[in-house]
Interface confidence: medium
């Protein structure tokens, strides 16, 4: 079979958006099944027509309604004949149009009066492509060949830049790049102190506007009273916008403030935020826990706990915990050093412990007291000890 692409030179140049019809002539076959190939891949395209010129002469058409750059390439037609594939000579389809940008100027943020560069590149066909730069509505400089780099010595306010690409088919305009001025960051806000303990505090905050320059670090300044002397200053890399303050004094009033810095310098400090560390939990356990059995139940007594350190703060109620081997257990809070226990089973052994609490929590438990079901009264001692 003889195959040839008709009506097309070896190179076919078409303007973008125009239709193209490639014709393929097949001679010497009665029923050719013409396939079109572009750059080695079969064109899966139903926009094809066949015209029988004679019984052994066919013309196949490949219609491209509106060509674009992606349609450019090497086309040929092929048919199968006796198990072999015959291919036509190729045609090179070139799609011409206004320049196409491969690099456009990008938005920038720069310090005042600092030099910077913007890039622009556009391609044809047709070549050559020349670039003209615009600053706002003013043309700057004459046409330069693509690619083009614009060197700017500096700006003192936000400025718009764009480039224009020209070729024989016309011109194309790039996106507009905005060059912003960098500034000092704004003060942080929403400063919160969380996870307070007697010696640690977690601080979190929201960064203010970064001044279009990456925030590098934040400083947390801590004093024992607003305007008092600085207890500590912690510089933390960001993000995250959090900091753990360690080695604080228990039950103490503090204030903190935060500022953040970018390459140009630090922001103003945010307002002072007061906080107070927790006191210490009681260090001592109640002593001499004992039981007095009465007709109405069981009275438990112990010695009052005296604060060992002022950081413990005022000692609050006592907490009593009891358990029996039948699984019954309970806790009760009492203000004094004496408690009347009800709801327990006198037929079962009873184990009782007591601790003193404050605003932080409960101190250590006392030695457990075992009240035996056979005893009239119990006393402090190791578990399961009995008094006679």
């Amino acid at each position: 079979a003889g195959l040839k692409l008709m009506g097309a030179p070896v190179k076919l140049t078409v303007s973008q958006g125009q239709p193209v019809k490639l014709n393929c002539s097949v001679e010497g076959m009665e029923e050719p099944d013409i396939q079109w190939v572009k750059d080695g891949a079969v064109v899966q395209n139903l926009d094809q027509l066949y015209i029988p010129v004679s019984e052994q002469h066919w013309i196949g058409f490949l219609s491209l309604k509106s060509v674009e750059r992606s349609d450019a390439g090497r086309y040929w037609c092929q048919v199968e004949d006796g198990g072999e594939t015959e291919i036509s000579q190729p045609v090179w389809l070139t799609v011409e149009g206004v320049p196409f940008f491969t690099v456009e100027p990008k938005d920038l943020a720069v310090p005042p009066n600092a030099p910077f560069q913007l890039s622009c590149e556009a391609v044809g066909p047709p070549e050559p492509v020349t670039i003209v730069w615009w600053r706002g509505t003013t043309k700057i400089g004459g046409p330069a060949p693509s690619p083009s780099v614009l060197n700017v010595t500096g700006v003192t306010q936000s400025t718009m830049f764009s480039c224009e690409a020209h070729n024989l088919k016309g011109l194309a305009s790039s996106r507009t790049a905005t060059v912003h001025l960098q500034a000092l960051p704004a003060a942080p806000f929403n400063i919160t102190v969380t996870k307070l303990s007697s010696s640690n505090a977690s601080v979190a905050w929201m960064p203010g506007a970064d001044g279009r320059a990456l925030l590098q670090s934040c400083t947390v300044q801590v004093t024992q009273a607003p305007g008092g002397w600085e207890v500590l200053a912690v510089v933390v890399p960001v993000p995250p916008f959090t900091c753990l303050l360690r080695d604080l004094v228990p039950a103490t009033n503090y204030s903190l403030r935060v500022r953040c810095a970018n390459a140009l310098g630090p922001s103003p400090y945010a307002d002072w935020v007061p906080f107070q560390t927790k006191g210490l939990a009681p260090a001592s356990a109640p002593q001499n826990l004992h039981a007095i059995r009465t007709d109405s139940g069981l009275i438990l007594e112990w010695e009052e706990v005296i604060p060992e350190a002022p950081l413990e703060g005022p000692l609050g109620p006592y907490k009593l915990s009891w358990v029996q081997d039948n699984g019954t257990q309970d806790e009760l809070t009492v203000e004094g050093t004496r408690a009347n226990l009800t709801g327990w089973d006198p037929q079962k052994d009873l184990i009782v412990r007591v601790c003193v609490s404050n605003a932080v929590g409960c101190g250590p438990w006392s030695q457990p007291l075992v009240v035996s079901s056979h005893d009239r009264a119990g006393q402090q001692g190791p578990p399961h000890s009995r008094t006679s």
Epitope: E31, Q44, N45, L46, D47, L49, Y50, P52, L64, K65
Partner: antibody, heavy 116, light 108 residues
């Protein structure tokens, strides 16, 4: 005169197989592709697929790929549309048409009813 | 899968101009074809390759295409033009064809 003669109406149960035919006359069968178009009762047209003039390649619409098979016998100038397992939703009028973009000559249609 | 979108119905008075639109993402690159189907009949090709009138079709039928929209225009619609109209085109890759949902033209 160019004519496409289609097989008669058919009633089948779900799960049954079916082949409907379309015989071309008045032109050289291998000069044109054949397409099949479905039209459900009271609904629009749906392109099912086409077979090339030489019957060597088929194109199917995404909804019909794998559900139907289009074939042709060049010696009898007949195109076929085949189902292995019919569903109630296959109830429709099926047209065979000469061509694939320029659908100029249409058969009268074959009504297929699938009902239990 | 690819879709062509048409308005379900268009109504005009006799002698008025009827416009039926068809939108699809591939229409900037693929030709549109228009088919007319009268009640109980097989469809008929009216317009091919966006704007070419099929043989035997009256001159009042014309077609156009711009961007993702193809339009069938009937200038001075007649009562006998009352029918369902379908646009038809290929998907972006060109490996299968699609009908629009159809537009019922009423000439009151």
């Amino acid at each position: 005169e160019v004519q496409l003669v289609q097989s008669g109406a058919d009633v089948k149960k779900p799960g049954a197989s079916l082949t409907i035919s379309c015989q071309a006359s008045g032109y050289t069968f291998t000069d044109y592709w054949i397409s099949w178009v479905r039209q459900k009762p009271g609904k629009g047209l749906e392109w099912m697929g086409s077979i090339t003039r030489s019957s060597s390649r088929t194109h199917y619409g995404p909804s019909f790929q794998g559900h139907v098979t289009i074939s042709a016998d060049r010696s009898t100038a007949t195109a076929y549309l085949q189902w292995r397992s019919l569903e109630a939703s296959d109830t429709a009028m099926y047209y065979c048409v000469r061509g694939y973009t320029h659908l100029r000559t249409w058969g009268p249609g074959t009504l297929v009813t699938v009902s239990s | 899968s690819y879709e062509l979108t048409q308005p379900p119905s268009v109504s005009v008075s006799p002698g008025q101009t009827a416009r039926i639109t068809c939108s699809g993402d591939a229409l900037p690159k693929k030709y549109a074809y228009w088919y007319q189907q009268k009640s109980g009949q097989a469809p008929v090709l009216v317009i091919y390759e966006d704007s070419k009138r099929s043989s035997g079709i009256p001159e009042r039928f014309s077609g156009s295409s711009s961007g993702t929209m193809a339009t069938l225009t009937i200038s001075g619609a007649q009562v006998e033009d009352e029918a369902d109209y379908y646009c038809y085109s290929a998907n972006q890759r060109g490996n299968y064809m699609v009908f629009g949902g159809g537009t019922k033209l009423t000439v009151l």
